[in-house]
Interface confidence: low
Amino acid sequence: TGADTEAVVCVGTACYTAHSGKLSAAEAQNHCNQNGGNLATVKSKEEAQHVQRVLAQLLRREAALTARMSKFWIGLQREKGKCLDPSLPLKGFSWVGGGEDTPYSNWHKELRNSCISKRCVSLLLDLSQPLLPSRLPKWSEGPCGSPGSPGSNIEGFVCKFSFKGMCRPLALGGPGQVTYTTPFQTTSSSLEAVPFASAANVACGEGDKDETQSHYFLCKEKAPDVFDWGSSGPLCVSPKYGCNFNNGGCHQDCFEGGDGSFLCGCRPGFRLLDDLVTCASRNPCSSSPCRGGATCVLGPHGKNYTCRCPQGYQLDSSQLDCVDVDECQDSPCAQECVNTPGGFRCECWVGYEPGGPGEGACQDVDECALGRSPCAQGCTNTDGSFHCSCEEGYVLAGEDGTQCQDVDECVGPGGPLCDSLCFNTQGSFHCGCLPGWVLAPNGVSCTMGPVSLGPPSGPPDEEDKGEKEGSTVPRAATASPTRGPEGTPKATPTTSRPSLSSDAPITSAPLKMLAPSGSPGVWREPSIHHATAASGPQEPAGGDSSVATQNNDGTDGQK
């Protein structure tokens, strides 16, 4: 399944596109990547509003949506093995295109701690509510979907494309149509800002007439941080309309000549740029020439300017842009150093947490601490990790190796441990005998007892139960029911499998063990040799953060 087009919003130095289509997070990221972008970041309330706007645009085009909730992937993910960090706004998640741990977040609900599998974030839209600025989409984390499996994927995704700069939309001074083609392969006739390297096709005229003229322009970087189309004067001008059509395409003032011609002009304090349409402030700082957080400082007599950087930044070679000083070069941290804009922060490897002597020190996380253990039974802390173990009669299970599952001794690799009936219990097993036989003291073999038509003998007393390792006592030499009495052929099993709880007495209906008087006795035995109780503890399936449904290959609870 592919992604359908798409809505687009361009603002500042970025464009956001929204797409519908059931894709996994990886497929969505790949789609954005093919056109030079990434799944969108939502690093501030302002950016959340831009993303909401593009989603509103997309949803406006979609046919009526009947699902109450709709989800759209964004570029926030947490890799397998990386645990939740409740102290951070992003909770240990990070943006796919890289970048620092941003302060803005808008989680839908408290996150469940799970390090087992990769988790991805989508924007959750409540389609039953009007999409208003005061209701920004919430962040929902969950499984990342699986390629080629639409049922497990969500409704769409949002991409972000970043640019050096933007051109103003072309202004038409008369009837016509502009079509912009962006570097990320979107065409649109209405962009509030047009990204660098976009092409514009202008078709002048009323549309139904033959006298249409076409123009082609490219959004170029004319000077550092100055982007324009290289056009001069308003486009599609017509004496018929003069200044009456779209203010003649002028940015500020439009002055009409007597012959229907007109000129664009600017208000006091502004000057007309080379395109003869746009007005810019005469103050050199008003065009915001300084980038990357630099402050524009006016020179003497207001003629020129210099850019000044905040602490932790320095000017780059262009003297316009601030670049971050990399404090991590000096290795200030014990384990990991993350350079952030204007500073740095120390991080600890998975399995460690901040602490210990000195700035940026790390100490081992005791995953086995009380109330914290991820293991169902035994937990052993190791330096930077942990491992789980199980009590006798259980083996490690679960995709992450933290659960314990009962061993069914009745179907062990060496065959049944009991001579006759075998009953599996949680963490153990016990043997039983058919009517007319009694359990030998070793708790495994059966010896011939007084003939009886009663039910099979019940579970042995606690001290007679089979040992977990299997009894070392040799089996009794007496005939045992699984082999049948000497000289009688084994009959086809006919009784149903007993379904017994661990300590329930055997109360199945009496088995008719002997044929009518005078004919040789025929032994019948249960068709399934053992009664298996429910398997070991299992994680309940739950909300969208349930680990139980993840497809992981983690085996032993490693972080």
Epitope: Q57, A63, A64, T66, L127, P133, E192
Partner: antibody
């Protein structure tokens, strides 16, 4: 062409309920929200609430919550607005209007209005 | 609730002259670059009719003598050359927050 056709005028006693209908035609009924707006004699416009006709989601002005119920019948492309516990203050012309599905939900098509008079 | 205040309450303008109506919101109705502010015209005995949406976008079929401007909290509807058929009450409306609210209306008459 796109039209919203409303039911006829109603006269009600205080404490009673009134149910006004609005039938849509000329466009895909489920692709637009339907809003209700009222206008008391000589007064301005007051938004009552909206309904999404596809899945019947509703959103009401808090002022009317508990008294207003909006419903729809997809088969006849009709939306209903019921207002209960009427008082003389509820005497007004009630308009239905449609808006786009998302974003700036301006009202681009209006019904002609239904006059509701509440009098003992 | 966002309160929308229109001024003046009524306006008398000569035919062919410019008419200007103001609308002030009690808080900003801008959102991510768009103004969630719409203008309607209502003639006696008729429902309102959409003129301008998102502060400055002319609804299709509306004469281009109508124009809208403004952002944040202050908005203006301008009729560049008043015609006899423009006699009506004009309302502004915000759709940025619930409940959607209207201004009190401005009555435009011919002088």
């Amino acid at each position: 062409q796109v039209q919203l056709v409303q039911s006829g005028a109603e006269v009600k006693k205080p404490g009673a309920s009134v149910k006004v209908s609005c039938r849509a035609s000329g466009y895909t009924f489920t692709s637009y929200w339907i809003h209700w707006v009222r206008q008391a004699p000589g007064q301005g416009l007051e938004w009552i609430g909206e309904i999404e006709p596809s899945a019947s989601y509703t959103y009401y002005n808090q002022k009317f919550k508990g008294r207003v119920t909006m419903t729809r019948d997809k088969s006849s492309s009709t939306v209903y607005m019921e207002l209960s516990s009427l008082t003389s203050e509820d005497s007004a012309v009630y308009y239905c209007a449609r808006s786009v599905y998302y974003g700036n939900k301006y009202f681009d098509v209006w019904g002609a209005g239904t006059t509701v008079t509440v009098s003992s | 609730d966002i309160v929308m205040t229109q001024s003046p309450d009524s306006l008398a303008v000569s035919l062919g002259e410019r008419a200007t109506i103001n609308c002030k919101a009690s808080q900003s109705v801008d959102y991510a670059g768009d103004s969630y502010l719409n203008w309607y015209q209502q003639k006696p005995g008729q429902p309102p009719k959409l003129l301008i949406y998102a502060a400055s976008n002319l609804e299709s079929g509306v004469p281009d003598r109508f124009s809208g401007s403004g952002s944040g909290t202050d908005f203006t509807l301008t009729i560049s050359s008043l015609q006899a058929e423009d006699v009506a009450v004009y309302y502004c409306q915000q759709t940025n927050e619930d409940p959607r609210t209207f201004g009190g209306g401005t009555k435009v008459e011919i002088k």
